[in-house]
């Protein structure tokens, strides 16, 4: 399982006070950003449990590992789910807490309830604050069952649940009718996909025994361990205050784990630290107990002492969970709870074990899991010891599970589980990734997806020219970086392969598929320079240049020219494609700019150097507006324009261009040329009575200038439906006469 | 699809007996509280009685206390209205109805099409 | 025990806004659940918990409730709404079921 721990701190007198901790024990765990580990997520679920909106929770990382919440600031705001995902890939697990309000008018008996498939789950909720009606219970949010307030048993309000099927597991709930649902009873059920004591898919494995309250994982048989446990049957005490799967962990604070709920990826849920209990974890165990929760009872045997935090402390000279086994018994000695190796390799491993009579070397055997058994190939014999090393056949997957170290003397037997996990050489699924190339040197992504097991720990990067049968050149890389391939040929293809490999004898994985990377051209290295340039428009530009003349042939495709417009912060480039051009025509350029212009060789996609920059002024575009348009309606079909000519002109005026358009009209605008610009007055005909026009113009010189203003102005009369504007102009004497 | 059928209406003289079934599918039948809803001809709506889903706890409307008895089968999906010493003013169609919780209040989201009693001499 | 007391009738235009209230002592303290009947028809709910709506029912119909009025409003009235309607509540006091005398709502 997922070493995962969510901490909920439970001394309630201050909301503000109260926080939650996720604490992951995995390798690399939250690091985020790269591929190998993503991130610690902690969050609160209100999918099921809304609680009214306050201020944002404060989330903080404390390094890679460890991530906290914090900023509640009612009561109610701790109401509810909250959640901590952690682990990567498949091993990716959602830890989830359940907190009530202890003001509630309902509280759970016992808020996480582990059950096994086709069990009868119990739910019990305890009144607090009597109300007489209905209590309604809910699962995951929806309506599940009625109770009328006469059904309380002792005090309880009680839900049975016959038959449980894993899609029974989630939130449950126990509300009175008409009651804020902060006040509920929240419970959490969490149903085993397999019946008591298997595992696996058909549910047809055994589970291992875990011991201390430990719980068989459905998927793996692994022991979920209770906090303060470890071992592969969660055999072994942590020392006071500590946890996760290797007992890493601290508790916070002066007084250890009091007043902290744990909470452990499924099946397990969440319980108080080893040795303390109660709804809020702040009491001690009684004597004679210990544990999670306080949950198991210690009944030493021959003068043992309990401690609530490890159960029997034995005197000299005697061993076991109750103290019941003399020292005479041969005991196998620090035993490994799991061991790692890789596929096909041939490990050797050891077991020590002590004893009278002493353990030679044929009463130590080592056993399989498909119940081969294995004798040592050699002992080292200590005062206070015997160690048996074990040569182990090739492994194959099917070695992976618990193996079982025994020994056995006249004085009697011990053995100890360990499991042993059996992983597989990570071979890349995919081809490195080209990120870059220049002609001498390929920069490499070898970050790919890869099947077998990770970590991964180094990375190496084959390569070799293509077609060729020389040695592969090999570079070992950081997991997480990009790698630079550097002294290669210009414009030459390698075939680019990936082997990775995980910790370990024999980690190294096949190597994966190849690809083809080809290096870039040679660098054009002529520089330039700008011959001349002149404008032939307010909107293009000639620009002619030279190159150096060197012997041998060019080494280039074309050109770049690069024209940049400093006031918008713009940059054009033209493509001219013929490395034997030498002029080019720019069009569509912006009147009245300031442009600095270079041009560079280019060959394939590598730019030579730019020749020294050239600045460029642009005639400013068309004049002026157009002054004092006026539009006069003349009869039901026609509106005469009256304007004075624009002031300060850059040259003659060519023409006028009116432009009509219907008020409110959603069609395109019309453009009238007024094609004698000494004009100051035109009439539009053909327009439709009773119609309100919208009216403006401009002059051209070189190009269109300014709009002028917009005027408004509506047709007479009702006349006939016209065929569409016309213009005719006059003098504007004359216009005004008529 | 939920569905409530009711049956067992008819006409019947004042001081005698009948006993309505209403069948229900498509939800958990056994864990929901029901209840009778009955409706005199051009008159409104009345509430008759309620059952738990449990079936152990029954509610009944004053008007029909202590002649009236709310059951439920939960093997059969069937709920059921023994009424005694029938009287005219019983005259009514009889709808079954399912008690729902939105939040934590109650109302009936799904009701029968209803049987016609009738109490005549 | 609990009463709740409704106009017996409300005219409304096609195309306008229907009130029908619902009176109560203290009824802004209750949950108020509104159904419509259509003749011959079973009692369909319109409204549930003062002003939820369930999946199905057009938006036109909303509720509300405080003091001693519970309210269902539709908007923009069409021929189909022309029914009758009776709110609801739960008497926790008493543990029963109480209705309204029913509106007759016609569209004009």
């Known amino acids: 399982a997922v070493d995962l721990t969510l901490l909920a701190n439970l001394r309630l007198t201050d909301p503000q006070r109260f926080f939650l901790t996720c604490v992951s024990g995995e390798a690399g765990a939250g690091r985020g950003s790269d591929a190998w580990g993503p991130p610690l997520l902690l969050e609160k679920d209100d999918r099921i449990v809304r609680t009214p909106p306050g201020p944002p929770l404060r989330l903080a990382r404390n390094g890679s590992h460890q991530v906290t919440l914090r900023g509640f600031s009612k009561p109610s705001d701790l109401v509810g789910v909250f959640s901590c995902v952690g682990g990567a890939g498949a091993r990716r697990t959602r830890v989830i807490y359940v907190h009530n309000s202890p003001g509630a008018h309902l509280l759970p008996d016992k808020v996480t309830h582990t059950v096994n498939k086709g069990d009868t789950a119990v739910l019990s909720a305890r009144v607090h604050k009597e109300k007489q009606t209905d209590v309604i219970w809910k699962s995951n949010g929806s309506y599940f069952y009625t109770l009328d307030w006469h059904e309380a048993q002792d005090g309880r309000f009680l839900l049975q649940l016959p038959n449980v099927q894993p899609p029974s597991s989630g939130i449950y709930s126990a509300t009175y009718l008409e009651a804020s649902p902060l006040g509920s009873a929240f419970f959490r059920l969490i149903v085993r996909g397999c019946g008591a004591g298997r595992w696996g898919p058909g549910c047809t494995k055994e589970c291992p025994g875990c011991l201390h309250g430990g719980v068989c994982h459905d998927h793996d048989g692994e022991c979920v361990c209770p906090p303060g446990f470890t071992g592969t049957r969660c055999e072994q005490a942590c020392r006071e205050g500590r946890f996760g799967q290797s007992c890493q962990e601290q508790c916070p604070g002066i007084s250890g784990c009091r007043g902290l709920t744990f909470c452990l990826p499924d099946p397990y849920g969440c319980s108080c630290g080893s040795g303390w209990r109660g709804s809020q974890c702040q009491e001690a165990c009684a004597p004679g107990h210990f544990g999670a929760d306080c949950r198991l009872q210690c009944q030493c045997q021959n003068g043992g002492t309990c401690d609530r935090f490890s159960g029997c402390v034995c005197p000299s000279g005697w061993h076991g969970v109750h103290c019941e086994k003399s020292d005479r018994i041969p005991q196998i000695l620090n035993m490994a709870s799991e061991l790692e190796f890789n596929l096909e390799t041939m490990p050797r491993i050891n077991c020590a074990a002590a004893g009278n009579p002493f353990p030679v070397r044929g009463s130590i055997e080592l056993r399989k899991p498909d119940g081969t058994v294995l004798l040592s190939t050699k002992a080292i014999v200590e005062p206070e010891k015997t160690t048996a090393e074990f040569e182990v056949p090739r492994l194959v997957l099917a070695d992976s599970g618990f193996w079982e170290c025994r020994v056995s003397t006249s004085g009697g037997q011990d053995s100890r589980r360990f499991k042993v996990n059996v992983k597989v050489p990570p071979v890349p699924l995919a081809a490195p990734r080209l990120l870059t190339k220049q002609s001498r040197q390929l920069v490499v992504s070898p970050l790919v997806s890869f099947s077998g097991d990770g970590p991964i720990s180094t990375v190496r990067l084959h390569y070799r020219p293509q077609d060729s049968t020389m040695d592969w050149s090999t570079i070992v890389v950081d997991p997480s970086e990009n790698v630079t391939l550097m002294n290669l040929r210009p414009k030459t293809g390698y075939s680019v392969r990936v082997q990775l490999s995980r910790p370990g004898e024999g980690g190294e994985g096949a190597w994966g598929p190849p690809t083809l990377m080809t290096t870039d051209c040679p660098e054009p290295l002529l520089q330039p320079w700008l011959e001349g340039w002149h404008v032939e428009g307010t909107d293009r530009l000639r620009v002619s240049w030279s190159l150096p003349l060197v012997p041998g042939p060019l080494v280039g495709d074309g050109f770049l020219l690069r024209l940049w417009d400093g006031t918008r912060g713009q940059e054009r480039r033209e493509n001219v494609s013929s490395p034997q051009a030498r002029t080019a025509l720019l069009t569509g350029l912006t009147p009245g700019t300031h442009y600095q212009l270079d041009v560079q060789l280019y060959h394939c996609t590598l730019l030579g150097p730019a020749s020294p920059p050239a600045h460029v002024l642009l005639p400013p575009s068309g004049p002026p507006a157009p002054r004092h348009l006026h539009a006069q309606a003349l009869s039901d079909s026609e509106i005469q324009l009256t304007w004075k000519h624009p002031e300060a002109l850059p040259g003659p005026i060519s023409k006028y261009v009116v432009e009509v358009q219907v008020a409110g009209g959603a069609g395109d605008p019309l453009w009238i040329d007024v094609d004698r610009p000494e004009e100051t007055s035109t009439i539009i005909r053909g327009l439709n009575a009773s119609t309100r026009y919208l009216f403006r113009m401009r002059a051209s010189i070189q190009g269109l200038g300014d709009w002028s203003n917009t005027v408004e102005e509506s047709t007479l009369g009702n006349g006939l439906q016209a065929e569409g504007p016309v213009q005719e102009s006059r003098a504007a004497e004359e216009g005004l006469d008529q | 699809e939920v569905q409530l059928l009711e049956s067992g209406g008819g006409l019947v003289q004042p001081g005698g007996s009948l006993r309505l079934s209403c069948a229900a599918s498509g939800f958990t039948f056994s864990h929901y509280k029901m209840g009778w809803v009955r409706q005199a001809p051009g008159k409104g709506l009345e509430w008759v009685s309620s059952?738990?889903?449990?079936?152990?706890?029954?509610r009944y409307a004053d008007s029909v206390k202590g002649r009236f008895t709310i059951s439920r089968d939960n093997s059969k999906n069937t709920l059921y209205l023994q009424m005694n010493s029938l009287r005219a003013e019983d005259t009514a169609v009889y709808y079954c109805a399912r008690n729902f919780v939105e939040s934590s209040h109650y109302y009936h989201d799904y009701w029968g099409q209803g049987t016609l009693v009738t109490v005549s001499s | 025990q609990y009463e709740l007391t409704q106009p017996p009738s409300v005219s409304v235009a096609p195309g306008q806004t229907a009130r029908i209230t619902c009176g109560g002592n203290n009824i802004g303290i209750k949950s108020v659940n509104w159904y419509q009947q259509k003749p011959g028809q079973a009692p369909v709910l319109v409204v549930y918990?003062?002003?939820g709506r369930p999946s199905g029912i057009p938006q036109r119909f909303s509720g509300s409730n405080s003091g001693n009025t519970a309210t269902l409003t539709i908007n923009r009235v069409e021929a189909g709404d022309e029914a009758d309607y009776y709110c609801q509540v739960w008497d926790s006091g008493s543990d029963h079921w109480v209705f309204g005398g029913g509106t007759k709502l016609t569209v004009l």
């Open positions: 059952i738990y889903p449990s079936g152990g706890f029954t």
């Open positions: 918990d003062d002003s």
